[in-house]
Interface confidence: medium
Amino acid sequence: APVRSLNCTLRDSQQKSLVMSGPYELKALHLQGQDMEQQVVFSMSFVQGEESNDKIPVALGLKEKNLYLSCVLKDDKPTLQLESVDPKNYPKKKMEKRFVFNKIEINNKLEFESAQFPNWYISTSQAENMPVFLGGTKGGQDITDFTMQFVSS
């Protein structure tokens, strides 16, 4: 069966949008008006993994690009990166674990926990124009809560 996907944008709980920063990095900043067109549109795929009522495994690709968010160890630290893949083979139902995030719903907000590195989350900084990263703390200075906006295909 083909993997199911939908297009969406994400904003952090401070309403910062995610945009490309160079070829392999995302950053978070406040956008208004026409600048909103800069925000990244994700193709969120619903993949195989541990699932519960509030937790759904997903992969986050960039729409119409062969790039996926993935979690790898760099210098012994879990790190978020944009990884290039062969578009003939992706997305797929059984994504490699580094591409899988547990989309967790809490009080109408979403967290994206790395399946590869439990308790590490897609995060943004309080500061403007900083990279999106994988953070190992929740409820601290860094932001781990997001909202999702559906985008028509």
């Epitope: 069966a1 939908l6 619903f46 699932e51 009522n53 759904i56």
Partner: nanobody
Framework: EVQLLESGGGLVQPGGSLRLSCAAS????????MGWVRQAPGKGLEWVSS????????YYADSVKGRFTISRDDSKNTLYLQMNSLRAEDTAVYYC????????????????WGQGTLVTVSS
């Protein structure tokens, strides 16, 4: 052409049991996650349960957990829902859904659904 034909509904007393069946055709049944959704009178669609392709993972709405059991027989291209300890609030039309995928706590996607079978729980 995809076809999903539900059966097994009926009138049952509170605390009773029913077993719903869904006969599938027109697609490679074993390849697809399947599930059940329901629509109570005057209400919207509500997800009830789903089962992964191969049947090794099952998922249930909190409202039916511990009372309902979903299963599948790929050799017969049939999906089942065993419903025990039925309550008045389980009264609904039950639909079988093909390629049912959960996208959030309250949102699901599916490709096809059947005509439905009515379950009425009343004394």
């Amino acid at each position: 052409e995809v076809q999903l034909l539900e059966s097994g509904g009926g009138l049952v007393q509170p605390g009773g049991s029913l077993r719903l069946s869904c006969a599938a055709s027109g697609f490679t049944f074993e390849d697809y996650q399947m599930g059940w959704v329901r629509q109570a009178p005057g209400k919207g669609l509500e997800w009830v349960s789903s089962i992964s392709a191969m049947g090794n993972r099952t998922y249930y709405a909190d409202s039916v957990k511990g009372r309902f059991t979903i299963s599948r027989d790929d050799s017969k291209n049939t999906l089942y829902l065993q419903m025990n300890s039925l309550r008045a609030e389980d009264t609904a039309v039950y639909y079988c859904a093909e390629n049912l995928v959960k996208i959030s706590r309250r949102h699901w996607m599916f490709d096809y659904w059947g005509q439905g079978t009515l379950v009425t729980v009343s004394s």
